[in-house]
Amino acid sequence: AILGRSETQECLFFNANWEKDRTNQTGVEPCYGDKDKRRHCFATWKNISGSIEIVKQGCWLDDINCYDRTDCVEKKDSPEVYFCCCEGNMCNEKFSYFPEMEVTQPTSNPVTPKPP
């Protein structure tokens, strides 16, 4: 049963390692994959002394942990590399961190990617 499914056809693309990987640095990535598989967008980033450094953004193929997510939100408590995924075109354009183990009300840290 798949309810309220949001099709993902393209995602914001960014690669901090673009020169080594021989890719574009930034752009829009069309998401390809088997017709029976769902497509998602993702973002990975680091927090270096309070400064957000985006690692990668792009398409992320069929992952049940991304199903039914319209927003890209990381909830792991203090991960080394932050990761979030979502469904919907360009849904990784903005991403947030809500630490899940906080006792107090967590604050959102929305980030609008600005390539360096």
Partner: antibody, heavy 119, light 107 residues
């Protein structure tokens, strides 16, 4: 610390029903897809069913489709498996497992609960 | 459904040995392959995901490689606590399927 605690297993006659529960703690349950995996005595692992973070998407192995129903109550941090029309071949230890974020893998498991289907 | 075939089904080794377990998928699964360790009476434990990424807290003597249809789990120097059964699992598409397991026993 992530903890998954299954309950509800036991002895049931063929054709009978059981409802398994999995109580989750130590993490934000509503942020993770969950699954049930079973292991027949002396055999390997078999994925049974999975459910997305909201419960809007559910998946089943062909061997249990139409007989088992997976569900979750995010307000109670609990995963369920309703098992109907049980057969002898459903006899197994049933594990509750969490889908890791960004891993596409079962990164945390419960200790399991034994379901025995026998007359 | 994607079939996962592990070999060998069992092996005997000594502490300090280098151990290699292989897993073959019936079709290409890219790098969507996970490895688990299970000890008798215990739940499985994730060792490696996405073919080669070590799960947090897993000793570096464990490593994974491969893509497409052929994958390998290597234990560089077998320790007493490594005697267990190891399973591969594809996460490319549902139904997610496991290999039959490889039991690593003491020689």
């Amino acid at each position: 610390e992530v903890q998954l605690l299954e309950s509800g297993g036991g002895l049931v006659q063929p054709g009978g029903s059981l409802r398994l529960s999995c109580a989750a703690s130590g993490f934000t349950f509503s942020n993770y897809a969950m699954a049930w995996v079973r292991q027949a005595p002396g055999k390997g692992l078999e994925w049974v069913s999975a459910i997305s973070v909201t419960g809007g998407s559910t998946y089943y192995a062909d061997s249990v489709k139409g007989r088992f129903t997976i569900s979750r109550d995010n307000s109670k941090n609990t995963l369920y498996l309703q098992m109907n029309s049980l057969r002898a071949e459903d006899t197994a230890v049933y594990y509750c497992a969490r889908h890791g974020s960004g891993t596409r893998a079962f990164d945390s498991w419960g200790q399991g609960t034994l379901v025995t289907v026998s007359s | 459904d994607i079939q996962m075939t592990q070999s060998p089904s069992s092996l005997s080794a000594s502490v300090g040995d280098r151990v290699t377990i292989t897993c073959r998928a019936s079709q290409s699964i890219s790098r969507h392959l996970n490895w688990y360790q299970q000890k008798p009476g215990k739940a499985p434990k994730l060792l490696i995901y996405e073919a080669s990424t070590l799960q947090t807290g897993v000793p570096s003597r464990f490593s994974g490689s491969g893509s497409g249809t052929d994958f390998t789990l290597t234990i560089s120097s077998l320790q007493p606590e490594d005697f267990a059964t190891y399973y591969c699992q594809q996460s490319y598409s549902t139904p997610w399927t496991f290999g039959g397991g490889t039991k690593v026993e003491i020689k």
